[in-house]
Interface confidence: low
């Protein structure tokens, strides 16, 4: 808190300019009019104020706008945004994507701070859904943004927004998130031809069910092992050796290196050893010849 003192003669700020960097904190408090500051916020960013001086400027704006800053001020906060607390930001009503971009730019290159998380939350809630332009902006600044959302939050993402998602945006998503995103991606890309469709859908396949994987195996897609290893185990288990061979194409040889890891390990245990031997990869652990395989899940469904 800065003490209230009279402004020294001749020091009253007529405009926000670089001469203010030499004002002591109490002089800034006494000599800079809050309304002038609010109308010339765009200049603050071009002036090398210290963090202590920025504290004083923030204090002045807080006094002028106790209910929260108007968007005209927020858009030009620049580095003063780093001084805001999540509590400050919860008072704001940010509706313009340009404002959001301007503030994200300030935090660029840093981890998502609580301030930024609060800002994004306020913005998205204000819009009602994660539209394509917003998602485009957020993933450009924070590639991991999508995977930081809960499955419930992801359910508000319209399929049209999926076009903005890049493979790296999904790197940290878990299966529950991909379960939500995959059907949206399938819908978004449904009118593309086979090879183009696979390129787009590939990153989302961690949420694909068995029947979709079977369908893909008929389309010569040559899925790489990295993608295969991210598939849902329960979706892979019912695939036959022939289907996996078709799905992976020339990459099928990579199964040997992954035979101890899920989902490959669990899939091997479900296959007849005879069938595995047809791959010529030396995969071991399949069901020995002559053993009868009972599908208990089918039996339960019938009884």
């Amino acid at each position: 808190e800065v003490e209230k003192t009279a402004c020294p003669s001749g020091k009253k700020a007529r405009e926000i300019d670089e001469s203010l960097i030499f004002y002591k904190k109490w002089e800034l408090e006494a000599c800079v009019d809050a309304a002038l500051l609010a109308t010339q916020m765009d200049r603050v960013n071009a002036i090398p104020f210290t963090y202590e001086q920025l504290d004083v400027l923030k204090h002045k704006l807080d006094e002028l706008y106790p209910q929260g800053y108007p968007e005209s001020v927020i858009q030009h906060l620049g580095y003063l945004f780093l001084k805001m607390s999540p509590e400050d930001i919860r008072k704001w009503n940010v509706t313009s994507l340009e404002t959001l971009k301007a503030l994200l730019e300030v935090n660029k290159g840093h981890e998502m701070s609580p301030q930024v998380a609060t800002l994004i939350d306020r913005f998205v809630k204000g819009r009602g859904q994660l539209d394509k332009d917003t998602l485009d902006t957020l993933t450009a600044f924070y590639p991991g943004y999508l995977c930081s959302l809960s499955p419930e939050e992801l359910s508000s993402v319209p399929p049209s927004s999926i076009w903005a998602v890049r493979p790296q945006d999904l790197d940290t998503c878990d299966p529950r998130q991909l379960d939500v995103l995959y059907p949206k991606a399938r819908l978004a890309f449904q009118n593309m031809n086979g090879s183009e469709y696979f390129v787009k859908i590939q990153s989302f396949l961690g949420g694909a069910p068995t029947e979709d994987l079977k369908a893909l195996s008929q389309q010569n897609v040559s899925m790489d092992l990295a993608t295969f290893m991210k598939l849902r185990t329960d979706a892979v288990l019912p695939l036959t050796v022939a289907e996996v061979q078709k799905l992976l194409g020339p990459h099928v040889e990579g199964l040997k290196a992954e035979e101890r890891h899920r989902p490959v390990r669990d899939w091997i245990l479900r296959q007849r050893q005879d069938d595995l031997d047809t791959l010529g990869l030396g995969l071991q652990g399949g069901i020995p010849n002559g053993y009868l395989v009972l599908d208990l899940s089918m039996q339960e469904a019938l009884s």
Epitope: E18, L20, I21, N45, P48, F49, T50
Partner: nanobody, 124 residues
Framework: EVQLVESGGGLVQPGGSLRLSCAAS????????MGWFRQAPGKGRELVAG????????YYPDSVEGRFTISRDNAKRMVYLQMNSLRAEDTAVYYC?????????????????WGQGTQVTVSS
């Protein structure tokens, strides 16, 4: 980035004058606010004069107000510190420093670029 080299220091009697110069190379000087600091033995650095990038605003602490004058010539890429009525307590190494116009990331080092310093000794 800007490189700074100070000159003009030396031995002067109390009451005497000295003019320090700071030559800048690298970036355009007009994009930097400039300051003169001093550091006496066993003490921290203190800002004794500051000037805005255009030269329109200056700052002096009470200890040198009226005795020291900072000026700049952006075309010649020079900054000057005219020191009059020198006292024994003005003895120190004097540094020229620059701070970029734009946001300050680090609250502890407002000035980004420093010269090597020039010794000023006031003694009879």
């Amino acid at each position: 980035e800007v490189q700074l080299v100070e000159s003009g220091g030396g031995l002067v009697q109390p009451g005497g004058s000295l003019r320090l110069s700071c030559a800048a190379s690298g970036d355009t000087l007009s994009t930097y606010a400039m300051g003169w600091f001093r550091q006496a033995p066993g003490k921290g650095r203190e800002l004794v004069a500051g000037i805005t990038s255009s030269g329109s605003g200056t700052y002096y602490p009470d200890s040198v107000e009226g005795r020291f004058t900072i000026s700049r010539d952006n075309a010649k890429r020079m900054v000057y510190l005219q020191m009059n009525s020198l006292r024994a307590e003005d003895t120190a190494v004097y540094y020229c420093a620059a701070r970029r116009i734009g946001p300050v990331y680090d609250p502890y080092s407002v000035y980004n670029y420093w010269g090597q310093g020039t010794q000023v000794t006031v003694s009879s």
